[in-house]
């Protein structure tokens, strides 16, 4: 009797178990009692990434330079194009449909992780003993100057935004 369920990489149509088309190919015609499923390769600008019964291939993603995008990996008949962002920009989402400039870390904050094409700058507050006095997308928190190693004393305490100010030791007369 006609099947009610089919094996992996098959689909049920008109009481027939038909083979799915392999990745990189689209369905031209379903199988019949007497013929196989017929599939055709996707064209150069298209892809299908699964075993399928799609009658149309998907268009490769376009990495629009007007949105700051560039090609990270060219698409094949089985994979989509992967976009990334130009230098100084990162993706706004996981699908990377547009780009925005990297965030700078404000004074009092340093760069914990430098931005990539797909992730923004990660900032962290400068802990005690460290400072950042610039707005930067690259600079980490810097340690306060060690006055002692210079045979000097702290004249003005450092903050998370400023370095300590060192001065000469008071000489007893």
């Amino acid at each position: 009797e006609p099947p009610t369920a089919c094996r992996e990489k098959q689909y049920l149509i008109n009481s027939q178990c038909c083979s799915l088309c392999q990745p990189g190919q689209k369905l031209v015609s379903d199988c019949t009692e007497f013929t196989e499923t017929e599939c055709l390769p996707c064209s150069e600008s298209e892809f299908l990434d699964t075993w399928n019964r799609e009658t149309r291939c998907h268009q490769h993603k376009y990495c629009d330079p007007n949105l700051g995008l560039q090609v990270q990996q060219k698409g094949t008949s089985e994979t989509d194009t992967i976009c990334t962002c130009e230098e100084g920009l990162h993706c706004t989402s996981e699908s990377c449909e547009s780009c925005v400039p990297h965030r700078s870390c404000l004074p009092g904050f340093g760069v914990k992780q430098i931005a990539t094409g797909v992730s923004d700058t990660i900032c962290e507050p400068c802990p005690v003993g460290f400072f950042s006095n610039v707005s930067s997308a690259f600079e980490k928190c810097r340690p306060w100057t060690s006055c002692e190693t210079k045979d000097l004393v702290v004249q003005q305490a450092g903050t998370n935004k400023t370095d300590v100010v060192c001065g000469p030791q008071d000489r007893q007369r």
């Epitope: 083979s19 031209v28 015609s29 379903d30 019949t32 009692e33 007497f34 013929t35 196989e36």
Partner: antibody
């Protein structure tokens, strides 16, 4: 239900061209399936002659030595057989078939 | 071309008794997807062939369950579990895996 009906002359002279038409109802010949011509000489077995596919492409039996042509008229949902340079050996019942559904057959006699 | 050889060429069976027809192909009918396109037909006297079994073992719609098909590769069998008077005629196997499609020479079933 799918139905196929052959039509054409029952008598053809030797060396002339045999022409038959198959009219299909209940299914579009451009949807799917292969549309076949099969013949059966008197008192003998079945011989596959060729097919035209849903997309218009063909395959023929090499034993017929390039004498056979199968074409279609999609506007009438018909497909046709032409067999050139016929001889008495081409006398047979000619069937059109989708392989699950067959026409009732038409007898063609080759004789002068 | 693939040669299809049927045995026996004729058989006479008492109603209610089983019958078996063998069909052997000169090369494997299994394609690269692992599917085998082998059909069985019955041609009753004065009629067109009617499909009984497709893809080796699938009964066509409306075919009684006393008909069954089996086999793989090059060896195929049609079985009738209990022959009835209406089963008389000529049985043909047909391979449609490879072009040209080829029929067996036929097996004539008679009732004792």
């Amino acid at each position: 239900e799918v139905q196929l009906q052959e039509s054409g002359p029952g008598l053809v002279k030797p060396s002339e061209t045999l022409s038959l038409t198959c009219t299909v109802s209940g299914y579009s010949i451009t949807s799917n399936y292969y549309w076949n011509w099969i013949r059966q000489p008197p008192g003998k077995g079945l011989e596959w002659m060729g097919y035209i596919r849903y997309d218009g492409s063909n395959n023929y039996n090499p034993s017929l030595k390039n004498r056979v042509t199968i074409s279609r008229d999609t506007s009438k949902n018909q497909f046709s057989l032409k067999l050139s340079s016929v001889t008495a050996a081409d006398t047979a019942v000619y069937y059109c078939a989708r392989l699950d559904y067959w026409g009732q057959g038409t007898t063609v006699t080759v004789s002068s | 071309d693939i040669v299809m050889t049927q045995t026996p060429l004729s058989l006479s069976v008492t109603p209610g008794q089983p019958a078996s027809i063998s069909c052997r192909s000169s090369q494997s009918l299994e394609n690269t997807n692992g599917n085998t396109f082998l059909n069985w037909y019955l041609q009753k006297p004065g009629q067109s062939p009617q499909l009984l079994i497709y893809r080796v073992s699938n009964r066509f719609s409306g075919v009684p369950d006393r008909f069954s098909g089996s086999g793989s590769g090059t060896d195929f069998t049609l079985k009738i579990s209990r022959v009835e008077a209406e089963d008389v005629g000529v049985y043909y196997c047909l391979q449609v895996t490879h072009v040209p499609f080829t029929f067996g020479q036929g097996t004539k079933l008679e009732i004792k």
